[in-house]
């Protein structure tokens, strides 16, 4: 569910949502960790509907969902919860 | 202006059969979750079930799976509720709702709900 | 199933008053909380969404807030129109679930 992505591309994010999604509703997860040309952290949510959400890396309900995501990652063995892509 | 106008309540016999319809207008159904719910004369809400827009998804109330189908017709802006095997307990106003999921994630349309009425 | 406990199930209060109300998830929710307003009669109508949210076109007189467990509702100024059951819901996870509604009298 969750990707964390590094790459050389300027920031990707022009408008940011605080707005809770449920999980059902999600297909993928992205994080674009800061640098590279873009100065922040950016959390782009791919949705089931095809759509694309930038999500504000401060909404607190992201912040649970990945610590709940990197506690069932660590303890379970199927696919690692973290896909690292690095050019 | 959205619309969601519902039919096909009324009086059914204990272990008979019911189909609920919902008609959309005003949105682009194909594109939206929907959900149904109920309320029991005097009582609170109860959610029913939801389809996701091809019907690939379709989630139900435990309690209410075996006896209960939700389909829609995207051609036709419609969503159904086939109930089946009713009982006394199935008596309340049904609701069908949009499930939305592009920007409140919560049912922000409802129709105007449709009495079903399980006598003999 | 994740149920909501909403308390009181009813309240008397006077125009202009500030009125809360609480709604309990068993277990963490997130933010994926919902508030509607039910007049007798009508369709639920949404209010509040992802918990602090308020629906469009909905008075600022409105508000939730909470995360985890615990949510809460409130009416800064209470007004003859407000007069409705109100319930909460979460949309966290299937089955999507209720709070029993607290129904809300002028005094």
């Known amino acids: 569910v969750l990707e964390v992505y590094y790459t050389s591309l300027r920031c990707r994010c022009v408008q940011e949502s605080s707005v809770f999604i449920p999980r059902r509703f999600i297909d993928r997860i992205q994080i674009l960790p800061r640098g590279n040309g873009c100065p922040r952290k950016e959390i782009i949510v791919w949705k089931k509907n095809k759509s694309i959400v930038c999500v504000d890396p401060q909404a607190e309900w992201i912040q649970r969902m990945m610590e709940v995501l990197r506690k069932r990652s660590s303890s379970t063995l199927p696919v690692p919860v973290f896909k690292r892509k690095i050019p | 202006e959205v619309q969601l106008v519902q039919s096909g309540g009324g009086l059914v016999q204990p272990g008979g059969s019911l189909r609920l319809s919902c008609a959309a207008s005003?949105?682009?159904?194909?594109?939206?979750?929907m959900s149904w719910v109920r309320q029991a004369p005097g009582k609170g809400l109860e959610w029913v079930g939801e389809?996701?827009?091809?019907?690939?998804?379709?989630n139900y109330a435990p309690s209410l799976k075996d006896r209960f189908t939700i389909s829609r017709d995207n051609a036709k802006n419609s969503l159904y509720l086939q109930m089946n095997s009713v009982r006394a307990e199935d008596t309340a106003v049904y609701y069908c709702?949009?499930?939305?999921?592009?920007?409140?994630?919560?049912?922000?349309?409802w129709g105007q709900g449709t009495t079903v009425t399980v006598s003999s | 199933d994740i149920q909501m406990t909403q308390s009181p199930s009813s309240l008397s209060a006077s125009v202009g008053d500030r009125v809360t109300i609480t709604c309990k998830a068993s277990?963490?929710?997130?933010?994926?909380v919902a508030w509607y307003q039910q007049k007798p009669g009508k369709a639920p109508k949404l209010l509040i969404y992802?918990?602090?949210y308020r629906y469009t076109g909905v008075p600022s007189r409105f508000s939730g807030s909470g995360s985890g467990t615990d949510f809460t509702f409130t009416i800064s100024s209470l007004q003859p129109e407000d007069i409705a059951t109100y319930y909460c819901q979460q949309y966290y996870s299937t089955p999507l679930t209720f709070g029993g509604g607290t129904k809300l009298e002028i005094k």
């Open positions: 709702a949009r499930q939305d999921d592009y920007e409140y994630y919560a049912m922000d349309y």
């Open positions: 992802s918990a602090s």
């Open positions: 277990q963490d929710v997130n933010t994926g």
């Open positions: 005003g949105i682009d159904f194909s594109r939206y979750w």
């Open positions: 389809i996701n827009p091809d019907s690939s998804t379709i």
